[in-house]
Amino acid sequence: TQNKALPENIKYGIVLDAGSSHTSLYIYKWPAEKENDTGVVHQVEECRVKGPGISKYVQKVNEIGIYLTDCMERAREVIPRSQHQETPVYLGATAGMRLLRMESEELADRVLDVVERSLSNYPFDFQGARIITGQEEGAYGWITINYLLGKFSQKTRWFSIVPYETNNQETFGALDLGGASTQITFVPQNQTTESPDNALQFRLYGKDYNVYTHSFLCYGKDQALWQKLAKDIQVASNEILRDPCFHPGYKKVVNVSDLYKTPCTKRFEMTLPFQQFEIQGIGNYQQCHQSVLELFNTSYCPYSQCAFNGIFLPPLQGDFGAFSAFYFVMNFLNLTSEKVSQEKVTEMMKKFCSQPWEEIKTSYAGVKEKYLSEYCFSGTYILSLLLQGYHFTADSWEHIHFIGKIQGSDAGWTLGYMLNLTNMIPAEQPLSTPLSHSTYV
């Protein structure tokens, strides 16, 4: 099938999401003559790169080429050879690399330089690798989900594409959770903002959007766990940390040097009388929740309303799509159903966290222990972040939709990023040519 003539002119694009815990490659395709229409671009492939995030390759940059090979070769197979040279490739690095750059611009540059050299060796049209800002990450995630939900389309459908799609043109807010940061982006009711840093203005398909966005660096699930451990070990009487966020019977040794490696734990750093400590799980949701809440400073707010850490947050408005780790964790815990109330989620979390580690390992034999051990913390963290961090309530919980894919495309910032860089989101509504939309309405 590699070199068969295509029945219609199809274009392709590749985006690599270089996250803090892993890298994923996404391949998108669309009909060339409809590239300014809304909703025509869709994902044809996701390839998860084997190994950690690129920021972990700082000590072994010579391995980056091999690390990227499998997924880049997969792209070579999926995209017809005749299209290779005109297929753009973009790599966006997120919070893991922001943290590395905070420690050392030289090391971040070195990693990106090697990544760029590696990606330039492929027959595609490589457009560069860069660290995207938290604001971009939030904005492009918001664009992605609303594009896929058809919110930018001016046509009124008589049917819904997805269960939670309403026929109105009200956009969805975007809640994104990664390993090192989390983003909240939505259109608030009040157009005026108290914090210009959190304000974005777009004109898309002939309509103006005043969007609020904020990226909380260090509040992704992995860095939040490091923060919690660094905070809790401060008051431990010896090198044993009895931790309510891990299952009863769970044990793990942590190196203090690993704990203080990240800038995220800087505020909790202290000289400890030991080089290692042992986490001993006690599996108590309520205590875990209390410990997590201590990561959110809600005592200081220079605005009318804040999320936490003095960051402005306008009143929540409308429905929200919660994706990436919000979805992965809640899906694992079987809590993504629209019918599950916030009270029920809390109840299930209490039950899950209190289950003995040996029992959990038996029940989920196919899951890597490193990931399996952290679901109690991650689930508790998600609840705390949404309820106490972002001020969702038991009532507004029903406005959160945990989304993995929409129409076969992953929810996340990559599609929005590519749409923007390929100029596929026009500011004005394109003039419809006869039958141009016949294929999908």
Epitope: Q59, R98, M102, G134, L217, K266
Partner: antibody, heavy 116, light 111 residues
Framework: EVQLQQSGPELVKPGASVKMSCKAS????????MHWVKQSHGRTLEWIGY????????TFNQKFKGRATLTVNTSSRTAYMELRSLTSEDSAAYYC?????????WGQGTLVTVSA | DIVLTQSPASLAVSLGQRATISCRAS??????????MYWFQQKPGQPPNLLIY???NQGSGVPARFRGSGSGTDFSLNIHPMEADDTAMYFC?????????FGGGTKLEIK
Amino acid sequence: EVQLQQSGPELVKPGASVKMSCKASGYTFTDYNMHWVKQSHGRTLEWIGYIVPLNGGSTFNQKFKGRATLTVNTSSRTAYMELRSLTSEDSAAYYCARGGTRFAYWGQGTLVTVSA
Amino acid sequence: DIVLTQSPASLAVSLGQRATISCRASESVDNFGVSFMYWFQQKPGQPPNLLIYGASNQGSGVPARFRGSGSGTDFSLNIHPMEADDTAMYFCQQTKEVPYTFGGGTKLEIK
């Protein structure tokens, strides 16, 4: 365009304290550390320490530890340095500089004169 | 602490000629394949201005006549051809480990 705007000159008495500011613009304030550097006699440069604006954690040159305090106000994108128990040895220009390991952007400096 | 010894303390060079300033570290400032060595130019009444980072990379907007080289413990800054505007103080700095340290400075003048 990245800019660091520092507060004006200070004339202080020995034994007193001084608090200077550094207002940042043109970048995401919490994405970079803020360093402070002392320059005396127009020649000797000494690194005082840095703060992580993201969470307020700081690291100091042992020489200044206990006498210097670094703080930030993220909503106003401003970093502060307070120096206590001043002596004539502290008369110098003090600079803030943005960076992890690369000090690519510097404030214009705050001149501190300690005199009875 | 890593001590940086800069030499010479002062230097006078004719216009169009080459100026070479050296900086020796008391221990290697290399880590993960990167040299954490920097060169700054400072003119009276101004803050230091980054010329070279990572031992040999030119800072933003820095003219090509400023070249940095070296690795490990021995580094140098070369200015060629020397121009009148290059009269200034020059400092080396290491950020491999805390406390970050600076060299004593070199005063460069026109002969």
